[in-house]
Amino acid sequence: CSCAPTHPQTAFCNSDLVIRAKFMGSPEIIETTLYQRYEIKMTKMLKGFDAVGNATGFRFAYTPAMESLCGYVHKSQNRSEEFLIAGRLRNGNLHITACSFLVPWHNLSPAQQKAFVKTYSAGCGVCTVFPCSAIPCKLESDSHCLWTDQILMGSEKGYQSDHFACLPRNPDLCTWQYLGVSMTRSLPLAKAEA
C-alpha cells in the first residue's frame, strides 16, 4: 500500500468526516464484511455535520482487514490519547485506511489545530493545494497554491503544511495564507513557478 503525501487542508477537504476521537482498544473482524472495526470515542466533530444528519457520534472506525488493501493499524496503546481522524462515510459508517490523515491531535501544530477547527473549510471547493514533487513545476490555475514542502524540506511535514492554508484572496485567486495571529499575511512568491 503506497500513499501520496497529503497537505492537511487537502485531507480535510477530501474527507467526508473529520473528527477528534480516542481509540478504545484492539480491533475486531466483522466476519460478514471482512473489515476490521476499531471502537472509538468521538470527542468532537470538525467536519461532516451535513453528511451525518441526526447521528450523535461514531462508535466505530472501519478499515480493510489486510495490509495489501491499505488497512489501518493503530499502534498506540494509550486510550486517553486523542487523534484527529479524517475519513470517508460509507453506509453511515466511518471508514479509514492506511492513507487516511490520522494523527495524534497534540502532534498537530497550533496553527493546524486552529485550521482544522475553522480555517481549512474556507478553501474547500474553491482552492486546490497543488503538490510540487519535482522541479520544474508550475501552477495550472489561479485557484491552485503550489505546495513545495517535499522539495524544500524533503518531507510532507514542512512550513506550508504546518503554518499555511490555501485560501481565496478574491473570487478568482487563491494564495497561501499564514495561519498565525494575522490571517492577512501571504506566503511570498506563492504564485511563482518553483
Epitope: 484492539s26 473482524i29 466476519e31 460478514t32 464484511t33 471482512l34 476490521q36 482487514a65 488497512g71
Partner: antibody
C-alpha cells in the same frame, strides 16, 4: 442443513485457465463471507482467497494475487474462483468454505485441479 | 511459505491426553483471538473443532479444548479415542497475509 458443493476442477495445461464453482444451500448465503482453501497432494492447507457477504471486499494470498479472482452471485447462492495463468504448483484439491479468514465452519468435499503438460 | 509452526506428529494411547502446539508471531496468533483448529481425516474435508481460541462448535466433543499464551496456541484432546486419529491444523488471522495455517500435525492413537 448446510451444504457446499464444488465443481469445475480438472486437468489443465500450465498457463491455462479454469473456473471453479461452489453451490451453497441450507443457509442465508449473502450473510456470510466465503473462502477458497487448497491442499496440494500430501501437503497442508493453504488459504487462497476470501470474499465478503456482499462481494464488495475481496482478499487474496500473495501466491495467487493477480492470477485468481474470487466472486459470488448471491442470487444463485454460488461462489466462484477464476484461475488464470495456472502453474504446476497450483495443483491441489480446492475447497470452498463458509467463513473468511478463520472460523470456517462448513467445507465442501473439494475439487481436484491438476496443472500438467 | 508463511505458516504457523506445529509439530509434525504426536501420539498417545487411548484414554490419555495430548496437546498440539501452534506457534506464530505477534502479527497473527499473538495479536488476535482469532485462532481456529481443524481435524482432517484422510480423503475428507477439514472439520472445525475450535474457534476463537477456545470455543467449541456445537456437536464437537468436550474432550477437545483450546487455549493461547503469547504467540502460541494449543489444542488439547483428553480421553484419546481411536477416531481422533487424524491430521490437525491450526489457523489464525494475520493482518499481512490474511489467513495462515499451521503445517499440520499427524495424531497417532497407539
Amino acid at each position: 442443513q448446510v451444504q457446499l458443493v464444488e465443481s469445475g476442477g480438472g486437468l489443465v495445461q500450465p498457463g491455462g485457465s479454469l473456473r471453479l464453482s461452489c453451490a451453497a444451500s441450507g443457509f442465508t448465503f449473502s450473510s456470510y463471507a466465503m473462502s477458497w482453501v487448497r491442499q496440494a497432494p500430501g501437503k497442508g492447507l493453504e488459504w487462497v482467497s476470501a470474499i465478503s457477504g456482499s462481494g464488495g471486499s475481496t482478499y487474496y494470498a500473495d501466491s495467487v494475487k493477480g492470477r485468481f479472482t474470487i466472486s459470488r452471485d448471491n442470487s444463485k447462492n454460488t461462489l466462484y474462483l477464476q484461475m488464470n495463468s495456472l502453474r504446476a504448483e497450483d495443483t491441489a484439491v480446492y475447497y470452498c468454505a463458509r467463513g473468511g479468514f478463520f472460523n470456517m465452519d462448513y467445507w465442501g468435499q473439494g475439487t481436484l485441479v491438476t496443472v500438467s503438460s | 511459505d508463511i505458516a504457523l509452526t506445529q509439530p509434525a506428529s504426536v501420539s498417545g494411547s487411548p484414554g490419555q491426553s495430548i496437546t498440539i502446539s501452534c506457534t506464530g508471531t505477534s502479527s497473527d496468533v499473538g495479536g488476535y483471538n482469532y485462532v481456529s483448529w481443524y481435524q482432517q481425516h484422510p480423503g475428507k474435508a477439514p472439520k472445525l473443532m475450535i474457534y476463537d481460541v477456545s470455543n467449541r462448535p456445537s456437536g464437537v466433543s468436550n474432550r477437545f479444548s483450546g487455549s493461547k499464551s503469547g504467540n502460541t496456541a494449543s489444542l488439547t484432546i483428553s480421553g484419546l479415542q481411536a477416531e481422533d486419529e487424524a491430521d490437525y491444523y491450526c489457523q489464525s488471522y494475520d493482518f499481512t497475509y490474511g489467513s495462515v495455517f499451521g503445517g499440520g500435525t499427524k495424531l497417532t492413537v497407539l
